[in-house]
Interface confidence: low
């Protein structure tokens, strides 16, 4: 099938960085400035992404690959291709429509991004709170009260915090 296609379709010979120009008898023409084709056999070149405003250029566009953006200082990327930039906040805060706000009591955020998450509920795992939570840190769970017999010295690792963005089920 591939062989037949290349015999019948001269466009299949056009490499990445070019396009098959129908206006010029299907010759392979280089992509115009600010455009690219990342695969061969393309009939058009794609427009390069422009990193404007809060976006800044991490990698320039070339004839064979799109530009890549990241975010200016004080902002961080969201999404797999950095399709969004969001303002950083401090630890212990989350970004709301009205800007950075402190985490409510009972929640924490240990990063400059993301949302405040509920403290781990140690009692769900039959454990007790060893270290209280703060706006910036989750609680640390320790052994259950029953395990705290004289001579017991081992401390159970803390139960994992819930995934970001979710209230307890």
């Amino acid at each position: 099938f591939e062989r037949t296609r290349s015999l019948q379709d001269p466009c299949s010979n056009c490499p990445a960085g070019t396009f098959c120009d129908n206006n010029r008898n299907q010759i392979c023409s280089p992509c115009p400035p600010n455009s690219f084709s990342s695969a061969g056999g393309q009939r058009t070149c794609d427009i390069c992404r422009q990193c404007k405003g809060v976006f800044r250029t991490r990698k320039e566009c070339s004839s064979t690959s799109n530009a890549e953006c990241d975010c200016t200082p004080g902002f961080h990327c969201l999404g797999a291709g950095c399709s969004m930039c969001e303002q950083d906040c401090k630890q212990g805060q989350e970004l709301t429509k009205k800007g950075c706000k402190d985490c409510c009591f009972g929640t924490f955020n240990d990063q400059k991004r993301g949302i405040c998450r509920p403290w781990t509920n140690c009692s769900l795992d039959g454990k007790s709170v060893l270290v209280n939570g703060t706006k910036e840190r989750d609680v640390v769970c320790g052994p259950s009260p029953a395990d705290l017999s004289p001579g017991a010295s081992s401390v159970t690792p803390p139960a994992p915090a819930r995934e970001p963005g979710h209230s307890p089920q």
Partner: antibody, heavy 119, light 107 residues
Framework: QVQLVQSGAEVKKPGASVKASCKAS????????IHWVRQAPGQGLEWMGR????????EYAQKFQGRVTMTRDTSTSTVYMELSSLRSEDTAVYYC????????????WGQGTSVTVSS | DIQMTQSPSSVSASVGDRVTITCKAS??????LSWYQQKPGKAPKLLIY???RKVDGVPSRFSGSGSGTDFTLTISSLQPEDFATYYC?????????FGGGTKLEIK
């Protein structure tokens, strides 16, 4: 560029299992979540669950609990979704989509894997 | 589970019209709501997240608003390429749930 390329269409008999794959390129899958969303013919979107490729941990919608398993192979940047005990209601297009570590930002999607369950 | 009720389920409009789609959550979801556009045979496309934040490249005619349980997607002046189905999604808690969809058709 960011791309999610999914495996091809499948036709299965009731009671069988299907395993769809989703190969990522253009980004590090360990920086994101991969979600699976399905859409029955002419119907709306239904979130099935997500996997954190960095840890392998996953969360599933209760509706699919016990029937769905999401796994990953970080060496090939591929995520898999296996659905067992198939029934005709599972006929749908299954999409993989990337999220973000702190948000359900399903901002890049695979082309979908069509699964038909028919006797 | 958090139910998302979207209305209307379909709407006919003309190019240049202003269109509003609403989504109501069965419980407050803070600002964890996004909107998707889907065209026939294609994967959905993220337009707006966290209620009102537009994805890079989404035209300014699209806007989102609301809080708590009631949310709105507005298209200020419909263009031919906007005719599609729109879905809201809550992502406060598992399982994430989509609204039933709103099919926007040409009048």
């Amino acid at each position: 560029q960011v791309q999610l390329v999914q495996s091809g269409a499948e036709v299965k008999k009731p009671g069988a299992s299907v395993k769809a794959s989703c190969k990522a390129s253009g980004f590090n899958i360990q920086d994101t979540y991969i979600h699976w969303v399905r859409q029955a013919p002419g119907q709306g979107l239904e979130w099935m669950g997500r996997i954190d490729p960095a840890s392998g941990n996953s969360e599933y919608a209760q509706k699919f609990q016990g029937r769905v398993t999401m796994t990953r192979d970080t060496s090939t940047s591929t995520v898999y979704m296996e659905l067992s005990s198939l029934r005709s209601e599972d006929t749908a297009v299954y999409y993989c989509t990337t999220g973000n570590l702190h948000y359900a930002l399903m901002d890049y999607w695979g082309q979908g894997t069509s699964v038909t369950v028919s006797s | 589970d958090i139910q998302m009720t979207q209305s209307p389920s379909s709407v006919s409009a003309s190019v240049g019209d202003r269109v509003t789609i609403t989504c109501k959550a069965s419980q407050p979801i803070n600002t964890y709501l996004s909107w998707y556009q889907q065209k026939p045979g294609k994967a959905p496309k993220l337009l707006i997240y966290r209620v009102n934040r537009k994805v890079d490249g989404v035209p300014s005619r699209f806007s989102g608003s609301g809080s708590g349980t009631d949310f709105t997607l507005t298209i200020s002046s419909l263009q031919p390429e906007d005719f599609a189905t729109y879905y809201c999604l809550q992502y406060l808690d598992f399982p994430y749930t989509f609204g039933g969809g709103t099919k926007l058709e040409i009048k």
